[in-house]
């Protein structure tokens, strides 16, 4: 008995060939011997089966002795043994229809779980193997689960269903809703304007939801909301903004926030959360702000940084075009009785300068100038 695998919703063509290459009488029946279709001369006739409106044949092939049964919009319950009767012969074809669907929506938030469920006919024992867009293979039976979806899981998942040494392939497009970056860090000198950007890693026709930037300043004992906003069809409207700092927010995507001035009291880390319409759960992006200040008080030249710096970062004070006078893995460095000239405060990571602030030290009889 020939086995044919079909996909739910697809069209399948079951073949039936006579030895004579001409149009002769044929019938297709199901396992209950109910006629599906056949011919009467050059006319197609249909029986009382449930397939009535979805069954067809190809009249153009009859003259060549081919009498296919075409079933459109396949359903799992179409799985059956189909019998073609032609020239006193019976050809049996076993059709097995499978369906593979994603648990809920194919648009899932980063960190959520994807469950793929296989619909299969009774009595079948298929195996399923799926390959994610990043090449990860998962195997299973009736259900396959992937927990903690990542951005790289966005794309086409290819799943192969194996039954009776035959296979059928399913392709499911999955969109992982996430920010492009999980975390970002902004380095600024005191007084500079700060720009925070939160680009999304997906595009949808209409984007509606709401969000908040929650901030933990390094110098504050508790965290607080800096801004709350709504998003309607990709248009941003501010709901509430704290009075200090007075953030500004762009009206269009990508989500964009402006802090008028980088000040030590704002240095710290924030979490932008975005809730999307019809989704339970939220998208998150961490953002960090490091602020540098260089000052001269009496005979002491000081450079300080505030905010989340890694222990391997180096803070240095040097006179322009000279070797560093002081260089430490600390958040504050100073030089006593600095020479006159342009001093540079540098925050660097393995030699790469992340942040630089210049301060002019004048001869001792005058006051310092900050460029």
């Amino acid at each position: 008995k020939k086995v044919v695998l079909g996909k739910k919703g697809d069209t399948v063509e079951l073949t039936c060939t006579a030895s004579q290459k001409k149009s002769i009488q044929f019938h297709w029946k199901n396992s209950n011997q109910i006629k599906i279709l056949g011919n009467q001369g050059s006319f197609l006739t249909k029986g009382p089966s449930k397939l009535n409106d979805r069954a067809d044949s190809r009249r153009s092939l009859w003259d060549q002795g081919n009498f296919p049964l075409i079933i459109k919009n396949l359903k799992i319950e179409d799985s059956d043994t189909y019998i073609c009767e032609v020239e006193d012969q019976k050809e049996e074809v076993q059709l097995l229809v499978f369906g593979l669907t994603a648990n809920s929506d194919t648009h899932l938030l980063q960190g959520q779980s994807l469950t793929l469920t296989l619909e299969s006919p009774p009595g079948s024992s298929p195996s399923v193997q799926c390959r994610s867009p990043r090449g990860k293979n998962i195997q299973g039976g009736k259900t396959l689960s992937v927990s903690q979806l990542e951005l790289q899981d966005s794309g086409t998942w290819t799943c192969t269903v194996l039954q009776n040494q035959k296979k059928v392939e399913f392709k499911i497009d999955i969109v992982v809703l996430a920010f492009q970056k999980a975390s970002s860090i902004v380095y600024k000198k005191e007084g500079e304007q700060v720009e925070f950007s939160f680009p999304l890693a997906f595009t949808v026709e209409k984007l509606t939801g709401s969000g908040e930037l929650w901030w933990q300043a390094e110098r504050a004992s508790s965290s607080k909301s800096w801004i709350t906003f709504d998003l309607k069809n990709k248009e941003v409207s501010v709901k509430r903004v704290t009075q200090d700092p007075k953030l500004q927010m762009g009206k269009k995507l990508p989500l964009h926030l402006t802090l008028p001035q980088a000040l030590p009291q704002y240095a710290g880390s924030g979490n932008l959360t975005l809730a999307l319409e019809a989704k339970t759960g939220k998208l998150h992006q961490e953002v960090n702000l490091v602020v540098m200040r260089a000052t001269q008080l009496q005979k002491n030249l000081t450079c300080e940084v505030w905010g989340p710096t890694s222990p391997k970062l180096m803070l240095s004070l040097k006179l322009e075009n000279k070797e560093a006078k002081v260089s430490k893995r600390e958040k504050a460095v100073w030089v006593l009785n600095p020479e006159a000239g342009m001093w540079q405060c540098l925050l660097s990571d393995s030699g790469q300068v992340l942040l630089e602030s210049n301060i002019k030290v004048l001869p001792t009889w005058s006051t310092p100038v900050q460029p």
């Epitope: 509606t208 939801g209 709401s210 908040e212 929650w214 504050a220 004992s221 508790s222 607080k224 909301s225 709350t228 709504d230 709901k239 509430r240 704290t242 009075q243 200090d244 959360t273 809730a275 319409e277 339970t280 759960g281 939220k282």
Partner: antibody, heavy 119, light 107 residues
């Protein structure tokens, strides 16, 4: 530790006035919006009014507009609710609450002050 | 004003039961929804903010879901200390409004 303590509740005749106070401690009071929420005996919660950090923005539920006034004194870390033209239906426990939670939630509440309007 | 409708108004349950309370807003409120627990003679306590985020210090048996107009608070395995009244509250637009409350009682 964040603490909110209401005071000034009591028995007042219909048409009378009362001023509720809420003393805040354990946080930077001037950085937060504050709310008043009330609960009539045996009933549910009803949001009454709120005020922004510097007192320039105020919002009220329709049923108290023109009779109840929310205000604050950041120098004294205090929130107030001035209640005039009181009615029997204003009888309730009045809670002051901090709008310091994420997504505009009320994260800290006082223990409440009972206001009874009766002749 | 946005009306918040909670159901059921009361529920009798046993320790270990799974309990779900629903809250429906008369118009879309995105995720501007919080859930509070109140015990007799006490002030309300925040459980869930932003429709689905668990407040720090709240046991993980509490969870929130939904967005737009339909929201659910679920207690996965009811504990003796969970017998209380629960309120949903919208913070989408003024005046802020609460649901009428759902009393969770011992069966």
């Amino acid at each position: 530790e964040v603490q909110l303590v209401e005071s000034g509740g009591g028995l007042v005749q219909p048409g009378g006035s009362l001023r509720l106070s809420c003393a805040a401690s354990g946080f930077t009071f001037s950085s937060y919006w504050m709310s008043w929420v009330r609960q009539a005996p045996g009933k549910g919660l009803e949001w009454v009014a709120n005020i922004n950090e510097d007192g320039n923005e105020k919002y009220y539920v329709d049923s108290v507009k023109g009779r109840l006034t929310i205000s604050r004194d950041n120098a004294k870390n205090s929130l107030y609710l001035q209640m005039n033209s009181l009615r029997a239906e204003d009888t309730a426990v009045y809670f002051c609450a901090r709008e310091g939670g994420q997504w505009l939630s009320l994260d800290y509440w006082g223990q409440g002050a009972l206001v009874t309007v009766s002749s | 004003d946005i009306q918040m409708t909670q159901s059921p108004s009361s529920v009798s349950a046993s320790v270990g039961d799974r309990v779900s309370i629903t809250c429906r807003a008369s118009q879309g409120i995105s995720s501007w929804l919080a859930w509070y627990q109140q015990k007799p003679g006490k002030a309300p306590k925040i459980l869930i903010y932003g429709a689905s985020s668990l407040q720090s210090g709240v046991p993980s048996r509490f969870s929130g879901s939904g967005s737009g107009t339909d929201f659910t608070l679920t207690i996965s395995s009811l504990q003796p200390e969970d017998f209380a009244t629960y309120y949903c509250q919208q913070a989408n637009s003024f005046p802020w409004t609460f649901g009428q409350g759902t009393k969770v009682e011992i069966k």
